[in-house]
């Protein structure tokens, strides 16, 4: 069976084709080659001689047991080599010779027992080394690591490392890899020698499900003393063994580390006193809790010095009390419990993401809700009922506002966005908004992107609601049940580049409303019920138009519509997916491509 | 279409068939077997994925006695610092995991329950596997 040509001469997918040898019928120019799940078993020298341009080679699960010297010789452009799931028994010293550009080596689940005899010391370009899910017992980083000066990611998770000694990291003292991210999760650790990490700098250290008791965790974290780490991730996994006990003593050792960002990811334990628990983390710049249960929500009003707080997929009794002077970014998403939003006091806040919480807001939105006048980004999408009772007084700095898939109330009672002269991006898609007031978008003089799909308009008619949006470049009016529009609805949108009118209910096409759209490049009228044109002769669309989508409409392919059908043919160079422009009527022409019709008036009169 | 039996409990019989062409082998064990009136147990899965499990989610299409419920999307792996350790599993890496589950207080009417599970993962998104579970429910007291 032949390989699948994904990109001609470049990318070939030969997965699971029962190949016993490397195929020799693929072009020399091949850059990406997937040979995974083939029983190759043995790689001799110059195995890939026919593919000198290879950049990515996937050999996952190829039952490879032996890799000989120079197996990859000639692959001087290879940047990614994947060997996952091969039961390697014999790896020659020169197995990886010739890989002068290799940046990513994945040797997950390859029976690797030690880094010491892994022959990769010459791979100076290596950025990522993934040796997870192996049999490595020692964390000693061999001397050859001093050659790997570009290494940024080292994944040693799911190995057999139990202890870390001072001598294990000696090589990092000699040549500090300032950007190294290290994942040691799922190693059964019980000892870290104090001083082992002293004066070591890491970009990221991940330790999840490493400790089988609170005491072990406590002593191991104390063993990290002296480490300077940009981002520290601690925690567990839901499907692995979890700690039976967890208290403030667990993290006391963190006081002896220098940490810029901290994350606790999944803990099968109720956190009650977070002030004591995170006592050593009051001054990290970014603090993050993922998938934890928090009992006492008042604790977030303590004087933590965090600039970024992230609470994701957590459980709360009620919406937390948030009073944090220095906080600039708050991400509070996909959380459970506390369904009603309560005011927060965050005077420095610039970025607020409250999406996907099922929250309801009794009154939105003004400075008093968030306790800040500095807010630039606000995401309230995928929540419950949000009642608009104020038009963003004190929030005039906003540039990005997202309400999609929340249920907005009182949107047509006053000019909700009147204060937002700096707003650039607004998404009110699928918010149950019924536009019944022409001043709905008044004030949005800087707006560039407006997404309002999935809403509705009074009498299914689009009125002149965009008159102030002179900077608008993107407008989505899809799925709005629109049937008619004001001939001057778009007259002020001279900067508009993309207009989506798809999935509405137009019976006819009219070019007149678009005559002022001098910058329009994309117009999507797909999934309407267009049968013909409006009475008058169709004019040309603006000359800037490059893409016109009229697919999945109800074209009436009869003689009376000859001029419209001819006009469509004349637009051929603009039309996208023309094969999906089909006649709907009459019955003998149903399903025929509109552009293949011979439009002469022998069509049945 | 070959049917794979999972288990029987006091009020349910569970089996599955593949609903994709690939039919890559997957081993599923439930211990103890699910009882629909209330249940607590362990789900054990052994599987070698044909693509990375990063950003794994399930589309669930549930049918209750021929009545279709709306499609449900269950996100399992968000993409970074995920809850489950198998979210970091790579294409070709053995996934051998045990997941605990529990539910209570749901009353099910007698009949045939079908659940099509479409597993989608990776970037770009592609189907990982598709299984159609059939649960025959025989409540002892309803």
């Amino acid at each position: 069976e032949p390989c699948v040509e994904v990109v001609p001469n470049i990318t070939y997918q030969c997965m699971e084709l029962n190949f016993y040898k490397i195929p020799d019928n693929l072009p020399f120019s091949t850059k990406n080659l997937d040979l995974s799940f083939n029983p190759l078993r043995h790689l001799g020298s110059y195995s890939f001689f026919s593919f000198p341009e290879l950049q990515v080679l996937d050999l996952s699960r190829c039952e490879i047991q032996t890799i000989e010297d120079g197996a990859y010789q000639s692959l001087s452009h290879l940047s990614t080599l994947i060997l996952t799931g091969n039961p390697i028994q014999s790896l020659a010293l020169g197995a990886f010779s010739g890989l002068s550009s290799l940046q990513k080596l994945v040797a997950v689940e390859t029976n690797l027992a030690s880094l010491e005899n892994f022959p990769i010391g010459h791979l100076k370009t290596l950025k990522e080394l993934n040796v997870a899910h192996n049999l490595i017992q020692s964390f000693k980083l061999p001397e050859y690591f001093s050659n790997l000066t570009n290494l940024e990611h080292l994944d040693l998770s799911s190995n057999k490392i139990q202890s870390i000694y001072c001598t294990d990291l000696r090589v990092l003292h000699q040549m500090p890899l300032l950007n190294l991210s290290l994942d040691l999760s799922l190693n059964p650790m019980n000892f870290i020698q104090p001083g082992a990490f002293k004066e070591i700098r890491l970009h990221k250290l991940t330790l999840r499900n490493n400790f089988d008791s609170l005491n072990v965790m406590k002593t191991c974290i104390q063993g990290l003393a002296g480490l300077e780490v940009h981002r520290l991730v601690l925690g567990e996994f839901r499907n692995e063994g979890n700690l039976e006990k967890f208290d403030k003593s667990a993290l006391e050792g963190l006081c002896n580390l220098t940490i810029e960002e901290f994350r606790l990811a999944y803990l099968d334990y109720y956190l009650d006193d977070i002030i004591d628990l995170f006592n050593c983390l009051t001054n990290v710049s970014s603090f993050s809790l993922v998938s934890v249960t928090i009992e006492r929500v008042k604790d977030f009003s303590y004087n933590f010095g965090w600039q970024h707080l992230e609470l994701v997929n957590c459980k709360f009794g009620q919406f937390p009390t948030l009073k944090l002077k220095s906080l600039k970014r708050l991400t509070f998403t996909s959380n459970k419990g506390g369904n009603a939003f309560s005011e927060v006091d965050l005077p420095s806040l610039e970025f607020l993401d409250l999406s996907r919480n099922g929250l309801s807001f009794k009154g939105c939105c003004s400075q008093s809700d968030f306790g800040t006048t500095s807010l630039k980004y606000l995401d309230l999408s995928f929540n419950g009922v949000i009642t608009m009772s104020s038009n963003f007084l004190g929030l005039e700095q906003l540039e990005h506002l997202d309400f999609q898939h929340s249920n907005l109330k009182q949107m047509s009672e006053f000019s909700v966005f009147l204060s937002l002269r700096n707003l650039i991006y607004l998404d009110i898609s699928h918010t149950h908004t019924r536009v019944a007031f022409n001043g709905i978008f008044n004030g949005l003089s800087s707006l560039e992107v407006l997404k309002m799909a999935g809403n509705s308009f009074q009498e299914n008619f689009l009125p002149d609601i965009f008159t102030e949006l002179r900077n608008l470049t993107f407008l989505d009016l899809s799925q709005c049940q629109l049937e008619q529009l004001s001939p001057t609805a778009f007259n002020s949108l001279s900067s508009l580049q993309v207009l989506n009118m798809s999935h509405n209910n137009f019976f006819s096409l009219d070019t007149f409303p678009y005559k002022c759209l001098n910058s329009l490049q994309v117009l999507d009228y797909s999934l309407n019920h267009i049968m013909t044109s409006k009475k008058q002769e169709l004019q040309h669309f603006p000359s800037s138009l490059a893409f016109l989508n009229l697919t999945q409409n109800d074209f009436a392919c009869t003689c009376e519509h000859q001029s419209f059908l001819q006009w469509i043919k004349d637009q051929r160079q603009l039309l996208v997916e023309v094969e999906r422009m089909e006649c709907a009527t009459p019955s003998d022409k149903q399903g025929m491509p509109v552009l293949s019709l011979n439009i002469t008036c022998q069509m049945n009169k | 279409q070959k049917q794979y039996w999972v288990c029987n409990s006091s009020d349910a019989s569970i089996s599955y068939t593949y609903c994709d062409k690939m039919q890559y082998p997957i081993s599923i064990n439930v211990n103890p077997c699910i009882e629909l009136k209330r249940s607590k147990g362990l789900l054990h899965i052994f599987y070698i994925p044909r693509r990375d499990l990063k950003q794994l989610y399930f589309n669930l299409y549930i049918t209750v006695n021929t009545m279709n419920l709306p499609k449900r999307k269950e996100v399992i792996c968000r993409g970074s610092d995920d809850d489950y350790s198998f979210c970091r599993a790579l294409k070709g890496e053995t996934v051998n995991t045990t997941i605990s589950f529990s539910f209570k207080g749901i009353k099910f009417s007698k009949g045939k329950y079908k659940c099509v599970v479409e597993a989608i993962s990776g970037s770009p998104e592609e189907m990982l596997f598709c299984l159609e579970f059939v649960i025959l429910h025989q409540p002892n007291s309803n």
């Epitope: 009498e459 049937e483 999935h503 209910n505 019920h529 | -």
Partner: nanobody, 119 residues
């Protein structure tokens, strides 16, 4: 399942009038487009008129424009076709059609009602 039942057809003299009715049952179709097609002997089936759920938009084939009027009563789940100034060439079987609530065009069809215009 949606069912469309037409009534009101019959024999009429040229210049006369008829009013066709179509009742939808099985589910409410108040938001979907509905319409009338016709098929004359030896000819293909073609659209005569169409009306949106809101009654705001209508479409008429050129041959009936000014003579036929489509309307609907959503409370009664009914669509009508008032046919005036009938001509012999209007003789056909008239079919009621409805889109699906998901927006698929011409999804549901009635059995048809015969209209015969004698000269």
């Amino acid at each position: 399942e949606v069912q469309l039942v037409e009534s009101g057809g019959g024999l009429v003299q040229a210049g006369g009038s008829l009013r066709l009715s179509c009742v939808a049952s099985g589910r409410t179709l108040s938001t979907v487009n509905m319409g009338w097609f016709r098929q004359a002997p030896g000819k293909e089936r073609d659209i005569v008129a169409r009306i949106s759920g809101s009654s705001i938009s209508t479409y008429y084939a050129e041959s009936v424009r000014g003579r036929f009027t489509i309307s609907r009563d959503n409370a009664k789940n009914t669509v009508y076709l008032q046919m005036n100034s009938l001509r012999p060439e209007d003789t056909a079987v008239y079919y009621c059609v409805a889109d699906s609530p998901g927006g698929r065009s011409y999804e549901y069809w009635g059995q048809g009602t015969q209209v015969t215009v004698s000269s």
